[in-house]
Amino acid sequence: MKVLQEPTCVSDYMSISTCEWKMNGPTNCSTELRLLYQLVFLLSEAHTCIPENNGGAGCVCHLLMDDVVSADNYTLDLWAGQQLLWKGSFKPSEHVKPRAPGNLTVHTNVSDTLLLTWSNPYPPDNYLYNHLTYAVNIWSENDPADFRIYNVTYLEPSLRIAASTLKSGISYRARVRAWAQCYNTTWSEWSPSTKWHNSYREPFEQH
């Protein structure tokens, strides 16, 4: 049994880091493998993560963490029974993938403005809470070409757009994702999408 693709890990900078790797053949990850991780810190102990299958030869492990600070460094040991398959380390602050925003809502009752709001996925005491920026994706269910991205570079988790920038009388969907420039993170996963019917009063044309 050998590791084909070494574990790569990302942290949500809160309570979970996710490590993925591939074996050289079909593997029952949860019964055959264990990923041991330990914070490099005085009197810390090793903790065990039981991996799950992620495709035939792929494994994924969700490492529970108390919290994360930039100084943290973890040792990682991948075991198959008594055999050490791989040894590495992981610094969560250098591999951050933020949590996805939630509770995306489209408010259509604000005159002819669409107000999209969502929730910041972090509690106020987390460092990332005040460092997230967002991308909002809006697309038409009827027209695949009608697809747009709005970059929200301010901290408030909301976006206002004129309803008239979208076509009237058809359904749209929106989703939002986040990233943090301070840690040069990857983008989060997209939030679940929300759907609404776009309708607005065409301006009365005078001749």
Partner: antibody, heavy 125, light 112 residues
């Protein structure tokens, strides 16, 4: 009520051995790291060794490395210090102390908040 | 190893007056989580040491509020707002960020 009671001290000749015990009650022993600290006559405090709650992490002062062994028996709520090849400079009062919670991912530290009464080790010919 | 240096080594104080002990570490004892791994202990004559302050500025349970700790990084101070006769003994600072734990030389507080 938290209690730590050391035993096993005594008079021993240079090169001899002693095994100190520290019996603990009043807290969830296996969750906490434990430490040994000593104090030579008329001197200050010197850290000797520490062990994690599960026993997997062990640390020693350079002055005792290779001669002393720390261990624990969580079923007996007891931490031990096996002292071999004793020297005159090991003469001291030995204290055990309750250390940080080590079973969490990041150990949680609240100081060495409880100490035993100490046991005296005298190394002399 | 991190070297801990206390001053003064002897501190005669009049009861009711404040007292202050300094502790300096040769290296930073603050971790990335913002905690200073620096404690203060008091050892009274013939007794085991007792914890006064942990993580730089947290007063241990049962310790009178006349004791306080301050400082960060490498420079720390233990203050007693009004010294009482029962406060006599040796005061030690200790770093527990990394092994080996290291203590200061001790400061002997005595009543004038």
């Amino acid at each position: 009520e938290v209690q730590l009671v050391e035993s096993g001290g005594g008079l021993v000749q240079p090169g001899g051995s002693l095994r100190l015990s520290c019996a603990v009650s009043g807290f969830t022993f296996s969750s906490y790291a434990m430490s040994w600290v000593r104090q030579a006559p008329g001197k200050g405090l010197e850290w000797v060794s520490s062990i994690t709650g599960g026993g997997g992490g062990i640390y020693y002062a350079d002055s005792v490395k290779g001669r002393f062994t720390i261990s624990r028996d969580n079923s007996k709520n007891t931490v031990y210090l096996q002292m071999n090849s004793l020297r005159a400079e090991d003469t001291a009062v030995y204290y055990c102390a309750k250390d940080r919670i080590s079973i969490t991912i990041r150990p949680r530290y609240f100081g060495l908040d409880f100490w035993g009464q100490g046991t005296t080790v005298t190394v002399s010919s | 190893d991190i070297v801990m240096t206390q001053s003064p080594l002897s501190l005669p104080v009049t009861p009711g007056e404040p007292a202050s002990i300094s502790c300096r570490s040769s290296r930073n004892v603050i971790y990335g989580n913002g905690y200073n791994y620096l404690d203060w202990y008091l050892q009274k004559s013939g007794q085991s040491p007792q914890l006064l302050i942990y993580l730089g500025n947290n007063v241990a349970a049962g310790v009178p509020d006349r004791f306080s700790g301050s400082g960060s990084g490498t420079d720390f101070t233990l203050k007693i707002s009004r010294v009482e006769a029962e406060d006599v003994g040796f005061y030690y600072c200790m770093q527990s960020l990394q092994a080996p734990y290291t203590f200061g030389q001790g400061t002997k507080l005595e009543i004038k």
